[in-house]
């Protein structure tokens, strides 16, 4: 199962739920579905308040229990380490796959943290991060921001991923904007 890591803004906008949490147990495999669940301790929620309603405490994250079907395998044994988890809600349960955005909170740049906590949401409605995978590539709409990190280096380590968000400049126009300048 292979997938290109998305721009963190894309991960935020396309997810039903974005939280910060610690993985606190070994995975349990469901004997019927062959899905596994990890026990987590949620410390912050950045997206999903309305979707969750009253059930605002997520205690488990679900994923296929096999690599071949895009299951997520958590490799860190540090139970105090916090992770940013962006996933989908299915029947009120948080689901992730290999392709989901799951990253140690400490590995995120200050700009990315700012994005998840405040800024990415501003661009969700109107703006689209448009991956440029090979040259030439051109904007298909004024609301698209060309994401060129993959052309230069690993997509999640690129400058646009770590420091920029695609945000509305004016109606019908989105541009890359620095998240650094918005950090208090």
């Amino acid at each position: 199962c292979t997938c290109v890591p998305p721009h963190p803004q894309t991960a935020f906008c396309n997810s039903d739920l974005v939280i910060r949490a610690k993985f606190v147990g070994t995975p349990e495999v469901n004997q019927t579905t062959l899905y596994q669940r990890y026990e987590i301790k949620m410390t912050k929620m950045y997206k999903g308040f309305q979707a969750l309603g009253d059930a605002a405490d997520i205690r488990f994250v679900y994923t296929p229990a096999m690599e071949s079907v895009c299951g997520y395998f958590h490799r860190s044994h540090n139970r105090s380490e916090e992770f940013l988890i962006a996933g989908k809600l299915q029947d009120g349960l948080l689901h992730i796959t290999t392709c989901s955005f799951v990253a140690p909170w400490n590995s995120l740049s200050l700009a990315q943290r700012r994005g998840f906590t405040k800024t990415y949401t501003v661009g969700c409605e109107e703006c689209t991060v448009f991956p440029c995978l090979s040259i030439p590539c051109k904007l298909q709409s004024g609301t698209h921001c060309l994401w060129t990190d993959q052309l230069l280096q690993g997509s999640e380590k690129g400058f646009q991923s770590r420091h920029l968000a695609c945000l509305p400049r004016e109606p019908g126009l989105c541009t890359w904007q620095s998240l650094r300048s918005q950090i208090a």
Epitope: T33, A65, E67, F73, R75
Partner: antibody
Framework: QVQLVESGGGLVQPGGSLRLSCAAS????????MSWVRQAPGKGLEWVSA????????YYADSVKGRFTISRDNSKNTLYLQMNSLRAEDTAVYYC??????WGQGTLVTVSS | DIALTQPASVSGSPGQSITISCTGT?????????VSWYQQHPGKAPKLMIY???NRPSGVSNRFSGSKSGNTASLTISGLQAEDEADYYC??????????FGGGTKLTVLG
């Protein structure tokens, strides 16, 4: 008591086909993922294939992918393994197993000309 | 392919204790609490002795015990008896391939 009984083994020529069955009793069959495991004569155990409780998800070892098909009929409490394009190296006792615990007694499959 | 490493053979005298190790990786033994141990006598089907690392099915003697540390699981048989002579296989859930097995350990009871 929980029981798994395999059947359908026998002698088949290389390139031939065989369908194994496993009749389950003593537990709620549809609540368990099931698998097939085999053991070649004098050798160790090798996982072959697995299927989720609903039958919606199937998994195969690389050595049998594209040749074997696992399926189940929850109304009959029966697990199946359709084996096509059989090779000499598929010769083994085939065991049916419930998730991670209960096994049947096995059925011998011999592939030989 | 044998994914879990077991010693090919171990031996002990009646009344002694022996331990069989089973070493895997973080995606199988180390990643899950789903290690099982099977006893197989010649010409017979494998019999479940331990499941979920350290649980014994009903009917299995309490002389059999299981444990795990990191990527290595262990089966200990205390008060060894002649009927314990058999092949022992470890099995683990595996994120990469669903189920993996050890190559088997032949237990010989001396005397």
């Amino acid at each position: 008591q929980v029981q798994l009984v395999e059947s359908g083994g026998g002698l088949v020529q290389p390139g031939g086909s065989l369908r194994l069955s496993c009749a389950a009793s003593g537990f709620t069959f549809s609540s368990y993922a099931m698998s097939w495991v085999r053991q070649a004569p004098g050798k160790g155990l090798e996982w072959v294939s697995a299927i989720s409780g609903s039958g919606g998800s199937t998994y195969y070892a690389d050595s049998v992918k594209g040749r074997f098909t696992i399926s189940r009929d929850n109304s009959k409490n029966t697990l199946y393994l359709q084996m096509n394009s059989l090779r000499a190296e598929d010769t083994a006792v085939y065991y049916c197993a419930r998730f991670l615990d209960i096994w049947g007694q096995g059925t011998l499959v011999t592939v030989s000309s | 392919d044998i994914a879990l490493t077991q010693p090919a053979s171990v031996s002990g005298s009646p009344g002694q204790s022996i331990t069989i190790s089973c070493t895997g990786t973080s995606s199988d033994v180390g990643g899950y609490n789903y290690v099982s141990w099977y006893q197989q006598h010649p010409g017979k089907a494998p019999k479940l002795m331990i499941y979920d690392v350290s649980n014994r099915p009903s009917g299995v003697s309490n002389r059999f015990s299981g444990s795990k540390s990191g990527n290595t699981a262990s089966l200990t048989i205390s008060g060894l008896q002649a009927e314990d002579e058999a092949d022992y296989y470890c099995q683990s859930y595996d994120f990469k391939t669903y189920l993996v097995f050890g190559g088997g350990t032949k237990l010989t009871v001396l005397g």
